[in-house]
Amino acid sequence: EVEKTACPSGKKAPEIDESLIFYKKWELEACVDAALLATQMDRVNAIPFTYEQLDVLKHKLDELYPQGYPESVIQHLGYLFLKMSPEDIRKWNVTSLETLKALLEVNKGHEMSPQVATLIDRFVKGRGQLDKDTLDTLTAFYPGYLCSLSPEELSSVPPSSIWAVRPQDLDTCDPRQLDVLYPKARLAFQNMNGSEYFVKIQSFLGGAPTEDLKALSQQNVSMDLATFMKLRTDAVLPLTVAEVQKLLGPHVEGLKAEERHRPVRDWILRQRQDDLDTLGLGLQG
C-alpha cells in the first residue's frame, strides 16, 4: 500500500503525459487524479513508465473502480493488463471483441497465462456461446485453445463456428473432444461437394463413426496415413480390407510401416489373412 501524502505545490498533473515519468511513486499516487487517468488511459501506453510506476497507476484504478474496471478503461490497459490478477479480471464485463484482441496481443508469444484464461472465460460466458468471430480470434492467438476446452464446453460451440477452425487448431485434441466436434463439422460442411468436403472434414475425422468412414471410402478421397492413424480404433475395426483400400487409395502402402501401431495393428488382427494378402503388403494377421 502506497502511503497517502499531499501533492507538492505545482505538481498536480493537469493531464496524463510523459512528464509523469519523472514523478516518484508517491508523487504519482498523490498528484495524479484517478478519474483523469481513467479518461486518458489511451495515452499511457506511449509513455515510458517503469514497472513500479505502472503498479501505482493500477492501484489508482483499483481505488476508483473497486467493483471492476469499465470496458472503456480495459481496452486501453496495454501492458498494465499483465499486472492484473485473475481476481481483478473476474470483476470485468468485457463484451467487445476489439477489447479482447487488444488484451490478447499484450500476452502474444507467451503461454496462456491465468489472466488470459480468466479473460477468455469471462468473455465467452458473457457471449453465451463460442461464436465464429470469437473462435477465430482465440485460435489465431492460441492455436491449441479449442483442445483446451472440455467436451462439455465444446458442446456450446455452434456448427457455424467450425468454419473458423484450422487443422492445426485440432492438433492436441483427444478423441473425446473430437467426438463432440466431428458432428458439428459434419453439419457445418454438409453442403460441400465430395473433394471439398473431405479437405474440410479431414482434421475432424478422429471423431467419425464407422458408417461415415464407409461412406468416405466410396468417394475416392485418398486419406493419408497420418489422418488414418488418428481415427477411432472402434470406428476402424469394422472396416473391410476393400473399404480401407478404397479409403486410403495410393496411401494404402503405408499400412506396412504402421502395422505395429494402433489402430492398424488392431484392424489387421480382425481381418482374414486371405483378404490382407490381396493388398500385397505382407501384412500378417
Epitope: 510523459e18 515519468i21 506511449a46 515510458p48 517503469t50 501492458y79 490478447l104 499484450v106
Partner: antibody, heavy 121, light 106 residues
Framework: QVQLQQSGAELARPGASVKMSCKAS????????MHWVKQRPGQGLEWIGY????????KYNQKFKDKATLTADKSSSTAYMQLNSLTSEDSAVYYC??????????????WGQGTSVTVSS | QIVLTQSPAIMSASPGEKVTITCSAS?????MHWFQQKPGTSPKLWIY???NLASGVPARFSGSGSGTSYSLTISRMEAEDAATYYC?????????FGGGTKLELK
C-alpha cells in the same frame, strides 16, 4: 510476422497536400501506437508524432503541428498521414513505425519501407 | 526538447577493429535506443533501452551509458556493420534522434 506496408512515392506541387498510408499486418493494430518519422535526403531522422489507433488520440512534435495530420482506420488496420501546404522542405522519405509499449522496451520496433515525397513545381 | 549529439559524424574502421560511437544528451535521459540504417532501407532497431540487443543483432555489438552519456560499441568490426547509426531518447516527447554516425569500412 509483423509488416507495415506503406503507399507509393508521391510527386506534388508546392501548396498541395498528400495523404500516405501505412497498412499493418501480423499483429493487433489497436494494441500499439503508430509513430511517423521524417528523413530528408542525406539527413537524419525527425519524429513527427503518433496516433493511438484504438482511440484516435494523437500527439505531435510542435514543429509538425500545422503540417501533419494523423488518422487511423481500425477496420482496415491502416494508419494515414496527410501533409498540407507542401514546400520543398517537405521533400523527404516518411516512415511509419510501430511503438512497442513494454517497460523494458518502449521503442519503435518495426518500420515501414518508407514513402518518398517530392515537392516540385 | 532534448538534443542528442553524436560523435563522430563519420568514421572508418578496419575489419577486426574495435569501434565506439557516442551520444550525448542535452539533459539527462533514462534510456537510449540505437538504430542501424543502410542506404535505401528503413532504420532497424539495433539496441533498445541502452544495452539490450534487438533480435538478430550480432553479439559483437553492445550498448552502455546513463544520464547524458551513452555509447554503442562493436568489439570487432565486420564488413556488414558498415552503416549509419542513430541514437534516440525515449524519455521525453518530442522523441529525438541524434544526427547519425556514418561508419565506413576501411
Amino acid at each position: 510476422q509483423v509488416q507495415l506496408q506503406q503507399s507509393g512515392a508521391e510527386l506534388a506541387r508546392p501548396g498541395a497536400s498528400v495523404k500516405m498510408s501505412c497498412k499493418a499486418s501480423g499483429y493487433t493494430f489497436i494494441s500499439y501506437t503508430m509513430h511517423w518519422v521524417k528523413q530528408r535526403p542525406g539527413q537524419g531522422l525527425e519524429w513527427i508524432g503518433y496516433i493511438n489507433p484504438s482511440s484516435g488520440y494523437t500527439k505531435y512534435n510542435q514543429k509538425f503541428k500545422d503540417k501533419a495530420t494523423l488518422t487511423a482506420d481500425k477496420s482496415s488496420s491502416t494508419a494515414y498521414m496527410q501533409l498540407n501546404s507542401l514546400t520543398s522542405e517537405d521533400s523527404a522519405v516518411y516512415y511509419c513505425a510501430r511503438y512497442y509499449s513494454n517497460p523494458d522496451y518502449y521503442a519503435m520496433d518495426y518500420w515501414g519501407q518508407g514513402t518518398s515525397v517530392t515537392v516540385s513545381s | 526538447q532534448i538534443v542528442l549529439t553524436q560523435s563522430p559524424a563519420i568514421m572508418s574502421a578496419s575489419p577486426g577493429e574495435k569501434v565506439t560511437i557516442t551520444c550525448s544528451a542535452s539533459s539527462s535521459v533514462s534510456y537510449m535506443h540505437w538504430f542501424q540504417q543502410k542506404p535505401g532501407t528503413s532504420p532497424k532497431l539495433w539496441i533498445y533501452s541502452t544495452s539490450n540487443l534487438a533480435s538478430g543483432v550480432p553479439a559483437r555489438f553492445s550498448g552502455s551509458g546513463s544520464g547524458t552519456s551513452y555509447s554503442l560499441t562493436i568489439s570487432r568490426m565486420e564488413a556488414e556493420d558498415a552503416a549509419t547509426y542513430y541514437c534516440q531518447q525515449r524519455s521525453s516527447y518530442p522523441l529525438t534522434f541524434g544526427g547519425g554516425t556514418k561508419l565506413e569500412l576501411k
